[in-house]
């Protein structure tokens, strides 16, 4: 197996994995396409978190761009060993592979407490607030209840699909970060395997 | 304060329809939900549906689905509900009540009367 | 459709007298209740909402209480004015099914 390919190829994937977290996040802001919500404030509480935009996203680029510059061919050798600082970037990869974890966590718990709370919307009784909160995220299997948020409009549908897709992506970027501290650990410890005539695509 | 002032009350013909008004007035707020209730002569209340009239989200109860159309009109703060193929059944005092903000205000009701 | 029984019907009590008249639900509304009154030949006034929160301008002298199936609405001193029909109002899902009603008379 080759260490750095591997990095490379998980690093591209959370470039990628950030750019749909940050758009999933912005999207947030405008339910319905209006802009008017974020204005007024009247957006869910965990939608100021920036869970995608932060977490799942600017912070996910900085294990990104580490991990796609292991495959580097620059990598100089030390102490005469031409391995050696490849395995130090290994293990350096280590370390921002775990601030990968952080910034996927904090999106994953950020978006499963927004689904579980449910939007803020204004309510039949025309109340702005939390109408499924006391529900403890059972609204999500009874649909028959979202129509007790009467605006903005879809906005049920709309929270619950970011949220979740937010969920799934911050899931997959752990998924891999955690990949990367494995691949780094072994990279690090077990030697750089690849040599520059070897070719791999991801 | 808020009022609700309701249209008139009608008599209609079996098989007509009719078009009930209620306009809100002294609103500061632009985001409330207009419900609909009927009320049959020394009976109880039966809840027919609600539009908001900011997002236009509407919801029927299903035993008034093809019966009552609610629309509304954001610019003269009126909302209205349209009742089709009357029969005796749908004699009843009508109600608009708007709710918002912890308050709710009820229009006056319109009598509807179906005869021949 | 979620159905709602109000209990008793009808009731007769003395002014001053305290009185709670119940509602139950068919199925779990957690706090979606909302209570009403209404006199002869007028419009129903709003109580209450969420089970107990006071609608505005309401004396504190009502109070809304339960959750889940079992909801009450309390009058701790009755006065002249409290006479008439209340009904409970569940919000949790469409349609929004009242109760029955409940008539209060003064004895």
């Known amino acids: 197996m080759c260490y750095g390919k591997c990095a490379r190829c998980i690093g591209h994937s959370l470039v990628g994995l950030a750019l749909l977290c940050i758009a999933a996040n912005i999207l947030l802001y405008f339910p319905n396409g209006e802009t008017k919500y974020a204005s007024e404030n009247h957006l869910s509480r965990f939608v100021w978190f920036f869970s995608g935009i932060v977490g799942g996203g600017l912070l996910m680029l900085l294990p990104a761009f580490v991990f796609i510059g292991l495959e580097q061919d620059d990598c100089c050798g030390c102490c005469g060993h031409e391995n050696c600082g490849k395995r130090c970037a290994m293990l350096s990869s280590v370390l921002a592979a775990l601030i990968g974890i952080a910034g996927s966590g904090y999106c994953v718990i950020v978006a499963a407490l927004g689904l579980a709370e449910g939007p803020l919307c204004l309510d039949s009784l025309g109340q702005w607030n939390y109408t499924f909160a006391s529900t403890e995220g059972q609204y999500l299997l009874d649909t028959s209840t979202w129509s007790e948020c009467t605006e903005p409009k879809h906005i049920v549908e709309w929270n619950v699909s970011l949220f979740s897709i937010l969920l799934a992506l911050g899931g997959i970027e752990f998924i891999l970060c955690l990949i990367q501290v494995i691949n780094g650990v072994l990279g690090g410890i077990c030697g750089f395997c690849c040599s520059h005539q070897q070719q791999y695509d991801c | 304060e808020v009022q609700l002032q309701q249209s008139g009350p009608e008599l209609v013909k079996p098989g007509a329809s009719v078009k009930l008004s209620c306009k809100a007035s002294g609103y500061t707020v632009t985001s409330y939900v207009m419900h609909w209730v009927k009320q049959k002569p020394g009976q109880g209340l039966e809840w027919i549906g609600y539009i908001n009239p900011y997002s236009d989200v509407t919801n029927c109860n299903e035993k008034f689905k093809g019966k009552a159309t609610l629309t509304s009109d954001k610019t003269s703060s009126t909302a209205y509900m349209e009742l089709s193929s009357l029969t005796s059944e749908d004699s009843a005092v009508y109600y608009c009540?708007?709710?918002?903000?912890?308050?709710?205000?009820w229009g006056q009701g319109t009598l509807v009367t179906v005869s021949a | 459709d979620i159905q709602m029984t109000q209990s008793p019907a009808s009731l007769s009590a003395s002014v001053g007298e305290p009185v709670t008249i119940t509602c139950r639900a068919s199925k779990n509304i957690y706090t979606y209740l909302a209570w009403y009154h209404q006199k002869q030949g007028k419009s129903p006034q709003f109580l209450v909402y969420?089970?107990?929160t006071l609608a505005g301008g309401v004396p504190s002298r009502l109070s809304g209480s339960g959750s889940v199936t079992q909801f009450s609405l309390n009058i701790n001193t009755l006065h002249r004015e409290d006479l008439g029909t209340y009904f409970c109002q569940h919000h949790y899902d469409t349609p929004y099914t009242f109760g029955g009603g409940t008539n209060l008379e003064i004895k």
């Open positions: 969420n089970a107990r």
């Open positions: 009540s708007s709710y918002g903000g912890g308050f709710a205000y």
